[in-house]
């Protein structure tokens, strides 16, 4: 697990505790809350990050219209159960034995039930739509410059392969970033679009997860891009199963 050897820290996740007592005396970093060893050469999974967060002391339109099956994370923070690879377990339960099924980004995709609720598989979120509204600027950003800057950001900061950034739409003041990644497309070692989106979301909120790096300073041709609202929609490979009561 690559971590900065000299001072034993995790560049990609500050919500870790690192010690030089790993195999062979190497620096080993464990995620707060779960204690799972993390690979500091890449992004940490959203599940482990949420668990760490919960354990920490409390502190003609070119725009895409989200599909009827798109999910928004309305439930907020919870202390998730992660599998040994750091992924969300398909079924999540709270301390009062209320359970629900989640997708691969940890967003609820069924009505809540009891301990008898079955979630047969972890359904993959294959399409993420990040909807941003930027603060007023002197003029609109050049679309191609904005597109290039956001693609560079996802490639360099979040290590997401460019092929997974499907599109960047812009209609001032709204920016939409589409991330797409099917199960069959994701190879071993590829950053998950859900993890990249979560790191981006935290960056935008000024809560960077990176160790010691400054916050996100987004500029398009030198002009600061300041986000005032973020909405993220998640589309699953299998549509969610909610009762009609919730949909009305």
């Amino acid at each position: 697990h690559t971590a900065a050897q000299d001072n034993c820290t995790c560049p990609t996740n500050k919500m870790t505790v690192c010690s030089p007592d790993g195999p062979g005396g190497r620096c080993q970093c464990r995620a707060l809350g779960s204690g799972m060893a993390v690979d500091c050469s890449t992004l940490t999974s959203k599940c482990l990050l949420l668990k760490a967060r919960m354990s920490a002391p409390k502190n003609a339109r070119t725009l895409v219209r989200p599909s009827e099956h798109a999910l928004v994370d309305n439930d907020g923070l919870y202390d998730p159960d992660c599998d040994p690879e750091g992924r969300f377990k398909a079924r999540q339960c709270n301390q009062t034995s209320v359970c629900w099924c989640v997708n691969s980004v940890g967003v609820r995709r069924t009505d809540k039930g009891d301990l008898s609720l079955r979630c047969d598989e972890l359904v993959r979120t294959h399409h993420i739509l990040i909807d941003l509204r930027h603060r007023p600027t002197a003029g609109a950003f050049n679309h191609s410059d904005l597109d290039a800057e956001l693609r560079r950001l996802f490639r360099e900061r979040y290590r997401l392969h460019p092929k997974f950034v499907a599109a960047v739409h812009y209609e001032q003041p709204t920016i939409q970033i589409e991330l797409r990644q099917n199960t069959s497309q994701k190879a071993a070692g590829d950053v998950d679009i859900g993890d990249a989106a979560y790191y981006f979301e935290r960056d935008i909120k000024g809560e960077s997860l990176f160790q010691g790096r400054g916050g996100l300073d987004l500029r398009v041709r030198g002009e600061p891009l300041q986000v005032e609202r973020t909405l993220i929609y998640y589309l699953d490979e299998i549509p969610p199963k909610f009762s009609m009561k919730r949909l009305t």
């Epitope: 195999p23 005396g25 707060l32 599998d83 040994p84």
Partner: antibody
Framework: QVQLVQSGAEVKKPGASVKVSCKAS????????INWVRQAPGQGLEWMGN????????NYNQKFKDRVTMTRDTSTSTVYMELSSLRSEDTAVYYC??????????WGQGTLVTVSS | EIVLTQSPATLSLSPGERATLSCRAS??????IHWYQQKPGQAPRLLIE???ESISGIPARFSGSGSGTDFTLTISSLEPEDFAVYYC?????????FGGGTKVEIK
Amino acid sequence: QVQLVQSGAEVKKPGASVKVSCKASGYTFTSYWINWVRQAPGQGLEWMGNIYPSNSYTNYNQKFKDRVTMTRDTSTSTVYMELSSLRSEDTAVYYCASYRSDGFAYWGQGTLVTVSS
Amino acid sequence: EIVLTQSPATLSLSPGERATLSCRASQNIGTSIHWYQQKPGQAPRLLIEFASESISGIPARFSGSGSGTDFTLTISSLEPEDFAVYYCQQSNSWPFTFGGGTKVEIK
């Protein structure tokens, strides 16, 4: 060589607290986690939690979370484990153990804590 | 938490025989398993780490194998001093947990 030396046996009354010390030597104290493991008479091993002396980060087994406190004193290379609201079931040998990588390679000699009225 | 189940609870063998001890994890833990030997009145002693990696000073007759959920500690030829209780422990995630132990006794 690495040594973990624990404080002596204790007899306590139910409801009282006990504080066991573990003094480390022979290695860089701040570089290795110190764990606390207990063993009731005739029973198996039970992990209570750990502390990373470099920054005092602690992690407790949920079972003991409300009753256990682990602290460290870097000036004396000593770690402390305090268990409060003692009950008879807490009668056990308490070990401190340090790990090189993930296995507990180094163990203290154990401290017998007897809880009896 | 990850539950470790050791079997058998007791193993009755004679010196010179081969001992095979099993440890099963409730979920995949890769190779984050470690084996200990404990004799009466003594602290446990680390024998094997990361499922199969030997520890200096531990006799070569002790070996470990397995990954995922099933792990084995093998003592190729039992010596009189090997009769003791053996524990497996996982370090995949907190809380770290131990198996219930296997007692290797003289037949």
